[in-house]
C-alpha cells in the first residue's frame, strides 16, 4: 500500500457515500473513497473524515498499517444535543456517568448491569421501567408476539462486569474505566472502544480492540436444531485465521462466535476477554492488535432500539472483560 506507485483505482466509478459521509481522496491522493468515521478502522488508503477533524490513530509506531479514526486532541463531544469539552464528565441521565475525551464519549452504568438468562421459573425475563424508579428491573412475563423477518443480528448486549473496580484508588488516582462499547459491526471485523485513566500518569486515554461477533459469511440459521429457535454459540468446525485490511493473523484460532435467533431475540457476547493478535501483512510487516474473544453469548429480547438516543447508543454495550 505504498504511495510511490502509479495511481490506479477500482474499475467501478466513485462510490456513493451515505448522508453526512465525505467523499475524499485516499491517503495517496489517488482514488475517491468514502471517508471513515469516528471509531472505524482506517489505513493509508482508507482515510478518516477530515471535515470532522478526524485522523487515523495507528497507536504504536510499529503498527503503521491499520488504525482507528480518532478525533484530534481536545475535540469536544456532541451528545444528546449538548456540547461537552474534552475531559468533562457529565451525568447523561440517572443511569450513566459519562466522560468526553477527544470527541469520544465513554460511559459507566450507575444501575445494576446483571444479565438474567431464561430459566424454567422465568422463561422470558425482561427489563422494565417502574414508575418513580430510575433503574430498570427484571420482570417475568409471557413474550409479546414478535413479527420478525429473518434472524435478529445484534452486536449489543449487557455483559457481566469483570473490569477493574471503578472506584479503585491507586497512588492518589481514582482509577476509572468505562465499559467496552458494543462492537461496531454485527458481523465481520469491527472496533470496540473504552476510556480509562488506568495508567502510570492517571491520564484519560482511549483504548480500542478489534472484535468479531460473528463472521459475515456464516449462514448460522441453517445450524438451528429442529424445534429450536436459537443457536446461541454455534460450533466453529475448524480453526480460522482473522483478516484485517489484507493482513492475516499469524496463528489460527478456534474462536467462539454468537449465533442467531428466528424469533426476534438477539444473540450477543455475554463474557469476553481481550488478547493480543499478531497480523502478518503481504509486505512481511507484523503488527499486534488487541482483540475481543468471546467466552459466552446470550440470546435475549433486550435488543437495540432506536427510540431513545442514549439507550440505543450506550445501554446495550458489552460490559467488561473477564480475565
Amino acid at each position: 500500500q505504498n504511495c510511490s506507485g502509479p495511481c490506479r483505482c477500482p474499475d467501478e466509478p466513485a462510490p456513493r457515500c451515505p448522508a453526512g459521509v465525505s467523499l475524499v481522496l485516499d491517503g495517496c491522493g489517488c482514488c475517491r473513497v468514502c471517508a471513515k468515521q469516528l471509531g472505524e478502522l482506517c489505513t493509508e488508503r482508507d482515510p478518516c473524515d477530515p471535515h470532522k477533524g478526524l485522523f487515523c490513530d495507528f497507536g504504536s509506531p510499529a503498527n503503521r498499517k491499520i488504525g482507528v479514526c480518532t478525533a484530534k486532541d481536545g475535540a469536544p463531544c456532541i451528545f444528546g444535543g449538548t456540547v461537552y469539552r474534552s475531559g468533562e464528565s457529565f451525568q447523561s441521565s440517572c443511569k450513566y456517568q459519562c466522560t468526553c475525551l477527544d470527541g469520544a464519549v465513554g460511559c459507566m452504568p450507575l444501575c445494576s448491569m446483571d444479565v438474567r438468562l431464561p430459566s424454567p421459573d422465568c422463561p422470558f425475563p425482561r427489563r422494565v421501567k417502574l414508575p418513580g424508579k430510575c433503574c430498570e428491573e427484571w420482570v417475568c412475563d409471557e413474550p409479546k408476539d414478535q413479527t420478525v423477518v429473518g434472524p435478529a443480528l445484534a452486536a449489543y448486549r449487557l455483559e457481566d462486569t469483570f473490569g477493574p473496580d471503578p472506584t479503585m484508588i491507586r497512588a492518589n488516582c481514582l482509577v476509572q474505566t468505562t465499559e467496552w462499547s458494543a462492537c461496531s459491526k454485527t458481523c465481520g471485523m469491527g472496533i470496540s472502544t473504552r476510556v480509562t485513566n488506568d495508567n502510570a500518569s492517571c491520564r484519560l486515554e482511549k483504548q480500542s480492540r478489534l472484535c468479531m461477533v460473528r463472521p459475515c459469511e456464516a449462514d448460522l440459521e441453517e445450524n438451528i436444531k429442529k424445534g429450536k429457535k436459537c443457536i446461541r454459540t454455534p460450533k466453529i468446525s475448524k480453526p480460522i485465521k482473522f483478516e484485517l485490511s489484507g493482513c492475516t493473523s499469524m496463528k489460527t484460532y478456534r474462536a467462539k462466535f454468537c449465533g442467531v435467533c428466528t424469533d426476534g431475540r438477539c444473540c450477543t457476547p455475554h463474557r469476553t476477554t481481550t488478547l493480543p493478535v499478531e497480523f502478518k501483512c503481504p509486505d512481511g510487516e507484523v503488527m499486534k492488535k488487541n482483540m475481543m474473544f468471546i467466552k459466552t453469548c446470550a440470546c435475549h429480547y433486550n435488543c437495540p432500539g432506536d427510540n431513545d438516543i442514549f439507550e440505543s447508543l450506550y445501554y446495550r454495550k458489552m460490559y467488561g472483560d473477564m480475565a
Epitope: 505504498n2 510511490s4 506507485g5 502509479p6 490506479r8 489517488c30
Partner: antibody, heavy 119, light 112 residues
Framework: EVQLVESGGGLVQPGGSLRLSCAAS????????MAWVRQAPGKGLEWVAN????????DLLESLKSRFTISRDNAKNSVYLQMNSLRAEDTAVYYC????????????WGAGTTVTVSS | DIVMTQTPLSLSVSLGDQASISCKSS???????????LEWYLQKPGQSPQLLIY???SRASGVPDRFSGSGSGTDFTLKISRVEAEDLGVYYC?????????FGQGTKLEIK
C-alpha cells in the same frame, strides 16, 4: 463529442519557457485524471506527466521534475504543462490525453501541439 | 526504469492474414493492486495514438474483435486475426504499473 484541444506550442530558444494548454469538452472533466505524452520527431512515445482529479497529486518523469509542472483548472476544463529551461531534446509533439485512472490509461488523445527548441 | 522491447520493429502483412507483435518487459509489470496494466496503442500515419487494448487483454470501446491481447509476467502479445488496410501504422505497447510509465519503441505494420 469528447474532445481535447492543445495549444501554446511554438518555437522557443534554449533556456526559454512555454506553457501548453489543453481544453477538454464533452465529458465531466473533474472525473478524470489528465496526462501529457510527447513524441520527438521520428521517434516513439514518451510519458511526461499526469495529474489527479483535483490537482492535489502530480507525477512527472523524473528527469523533467525540476523543469516541468503539470496543473489543472477544473472550472475551466483545462490542463496545463509549464515548461521551463527548455532544451533541444524537448523538441516534440506534445499530446494531451485523458487518463481514466481505472482500467485503462489514455483513452482519449488530442491532436497534439508542436514545441521546437532551437536557437 | 522498466524497458519495453517490441519485436519485430517492422512487419509486412498481406490483407486478411494474421499479424503478431511481441512485447517483453525488463521486469514484472504487476501493479501493487494485483492488476497488470499492459496496453497497446496504434498510431496511424499523421494521427494521434489510439487505445486498442488495456489490462493485457481487454478491448477498448469501438475496437474490432480481430484485435486481441494476451500474456502475463513479462511476455505479452498483440494479435490481429485478419489484417485490414485501416490497420497500418505504428503499434506501441505500454506499461502503467510502475514509474516511470514507459512505451515500447514501436512496431511498424505495413501492408504487402
Amino acid at each position: 463529442e469528447v474532445q481535447l484541444v492543445e495549444s501554446g506550442g511554438g518555437l522557443v530558444q534554449p533556456g526559454g519557457s512555454l506553457r501548453l494548454s489543453c481544453a477538454a469538452s464533452g465529458f465531466t472533466f473533474s472525473d478524470y485524471y489528465m496526462a501529457w505524452v510527447r513524441q520527438a520527431p521520428g521517434k516513439g512515445l514518451e510519458w511526461v506527466a499526469n495529474i489527479n482529479y483535483e490537482g492535489s497529486r502530480t507525477d512527472l518523469l523524473e528527469s523533467l521534475k525540476s523543469r516541468f509542472t503539470i496543473s489543472r483548472d477544473n472550472a475551466k476544463n483545462s490542463v496545463y504543462l509549464q515548461m521551463n529551461s527548455l532544451r533541444a531534446e524537448d523538441t516534440a509533439v506534445y499530446y494531451c490525453a485523458r487518463d481514466t485512472s481505472r482500467g485503462s490509461y489514455f483513452d482519449v488523445w488530442g491532436a497534439g501541439t508542436t514545441v521546437t527548441v532551437s536557437s | 526504469d522498466i524497458v519495453m522491447t517490441q519485436t519485430p520493429l517492422s512487419l509486412s502483412v498481406s490483407l486478411g492474414d494474421q499479424a503478431s507483435i511481441s512485447c517483453k518487459s525488463s521486469q514484472s509489470i504487476v501493479h501493487y493492486n494485483g492488476n497488470t496494466y499492459l496496453e497497446w496503442y496504434l498510431q496511424k500515419p499523421g494521427q494521434s495514438p489510439q487505445l486498442l487494448i488495456y489490462k493485457v487483454s481487454s478491448r477498448a470501446s469501438g475496437v474490432p474483435d480481430r484485435f486481441s491481447g494476451s500474456g502475463s509476467g513479462t511476455d505479452f502479445t498483440l494479435k490481429i486475426s485478419r489484417v485490414e488496410a485501416e490497420d497500418l501504422g505504428v503499434y506501441y505497447c505500454f506499461q502503467g504499473s510502475h514509474f516511470p510509465l514507459t512505451f515500447g519503441q514501436g512496431t511498424k505494420l505495413e501492408i504487402k
